[in-house]
């Protein structure tokens, strides 16, 4: 039903969002998560994993920087709100962003190899 | 904050399960009354693939698994006894159990920890 | 067996270089960050590096910064520093250490350490 | 950065005493603390980490508590072996940083 998330999935607040333990690069987190109909982690706010704030691991989430608009952006084309991370105008641009439930946030190479998270909206 | 699904407001869903992740420490017995008060029971785990999962989610937790000492076997909540190893068993003191990152350890039952609860749906 | 072989600590004099290397086996070295931490004589420890999984990514203590360069060999399961303009408050044992399962900030296993002695 | 000071910064105990060394964080770290035990000559060994997970192999007297800046390392019934100086570490953010240490001497 509309209200469920798929097996290994995590249902919170009207989202599903599936935690690897496996570690990938940037770029296969986010092919494994289209594959699986949703999309590398978008935060709406830092709160939004606070089920998991005690966790001590770093997540690659769906931001990327976008050299056209000059910003960084999610996945769906919205830009970074500036308050969600303070630190973000010392991130190299040219890296992805780990992300820990707890608010941290570091700028890594793409190519480095990290645990992700994907996020289906229910509804 | 939106709320959808078959948990409680705040409670997330896992494999058919609801769980409350708490971020209070308290005491076994402390923890025990706690989930009762929210009709559910202390965690518990059913197999290797839940206990990574917790384990991802917060590194240690109190679950429903205890003995009276350390002459008599460990036991579930509902009075069953416990298959799996509980690390350090052998000292005496230590008569509760904790989740401790994908590994079952005993604890001394005065500790506070932080508790999770669970309900099944 | 986890087991960390550091190798490459000398006496060097102000300004000199060296490489130190630490060669590593008893587990998949290409998934852990791996770190530097050094300790100077009769003192405590003092984290000096620590490079990401792939090496794709250095953070550095800001006494080594500019100075100092972390790489690693995946293909050896070697673990390199690079230790240029050094400085008399460099001497110290240097230790490498593999970052722990559950969060890489942690130091789980060490190697027995490297002497470095800056000196003229 | 993160300053990290422990007390006392030694102490004279008896085998089988109960002794407690704290930490504590110049801003709040959540849980992301580690400590260690360091013999003389001999690499640092890791005991606890998330602030009171206990590492595999390490002896189930040694216990960690504590979250937020104020942290506790507590050895419940001292062993010969354990007489070496201890090391509180931080991994919330970069630099990582460690306390000064504790050198726990035999009474």
């Known amino acids: 039903d509309c209200c469920s998330c798929q097996e290994k999935w995590v249902g919170y607040r009207c989202n599903c969002y599936f935690i690897s333990s496996e570690q990938k690069t940037w770029n296969e987190s986010r092919h494994l998560c289209a594959s699986q109909k949703s999309s590398l982690l978008q935060l709406q706010n830092t709160d939004e994993l606070d089920f998991m704030s005690s966790s001590q691991q770093f997540y690659w989430i769906g931001l990327s920087y976008s050299e056209e608009h000059t910003a960084w952006l999610w996945e769906n084309g919205s830009a970074l709100s500036q308050y969600l991370f303070p630190s973000f105008e010392t991130f190299n641009t040219k890296n992805c962003i780990a992300y820990n439930p707890n608010g941290n946030a570091l700028d890594e190479s793409c190519e480095d190899k990290n645990r992700y998270i994907c996020k289906q909206q229910l509804i | 904050a939106r709320h959808c699904g078959h948990c409680p407001e705040e409670w997330i869903t896992y494999s058919n399960s609801c769980y409350y992740i708490g971020k209070e420490r308290r005491t076994w017995e402390e923890s025990l009354l706690a989930c009762t008060s929210k009709n559910s029971s202390l965690l518990s785990i059913d197999n290797e693939e839940e206990m990574k999962f917790l384990s991802i989610i917060s590194p240690s937790s109190w679950i429903g698994v205890f003995r009276n000492s350390s002459h008599h076997p460990w036991v579930t909540m509902n009075g069953l006894a416990f298959k799996h190893e509980i690390k350090d068993s052998d000292n005496a003191e230590l008569n509760c159990a904790v989740l401790q990152v994908n590994r079952l350890k005993s604890a001394q039952c005065g500790s506070s920890i932080i508790y999770h609860c669970k309900h099944k749906l | 067996e986890v087991q960390l072989l550091e190798s490459g600590g000398d006496l060097v004099q102000p300004g000199g270089s060296l490489r130190l290397s630490c060669a590593a086996s008893?587990?998949?070295?290409?998934?852990?960050?791996m770190h530097w931490v050094r300790q100077a004589p009769g003192k405590g420890l003092e984290w000096v590096s620590t490079i990401t999984n792939s090496g794709g990514t250095t953070y550095y203590a800001d006494s080594v910064k500019g100075r100092f360069t972390l790489s690693r060999d995946n293909s050896k399961n070697t673990l390199y520093l690079q230790m240029n303009s050094l400085r008399a408050e460099d001497t110290a044992v240097y230790y490498c250490?593999?970052?722990?399962?559950?969060?890489?900030?942690?130091?789980?296993?060490w190697g027995q350490g490297t002497l470095v002695t800056v000196s003229s | 950065d993160i300053q990290m000071t422990q007390t006392p910064s030694s102490v004279s105990a008896s085998v089988g005493d109960r002794v407690t060394i704290t930490c504590r964080a110049s801003q709040g770290i959540s849980s992301w603390l580690a400590w260690y035990q360091q013999k003389p000559g001999k690499a640092p060994k890791l005991l606890i980490y998330?602030?009171?997970s206990l590492q595999s192999g390490v002896p189930s007297r040694f216990s960690g508590s504590g979250s937020g800046t104020d942290f506790t390392l507590t050895i419940s019934s001292l062993q010969p072996e354990d007489f070496a100086t201890y090391y509180c570490?931080?991994?919330?953010?970069?630099?990582?940083?460690f306390g000064q240490g504790t050198k726990l001497e035999i009474k």
């Open positions: 998330a602030a009171s």
């Open positions: 570490q931080q991994a919330n953010s970069f630099p990582y940083t």
């Open positions: 008893g587990f998949t070295f290409d998934n852990y960050a």
């Open positions: 250490a593999k970052a722990h399962y559950y969060a890489r900030g942690y130091f789980d296993f």
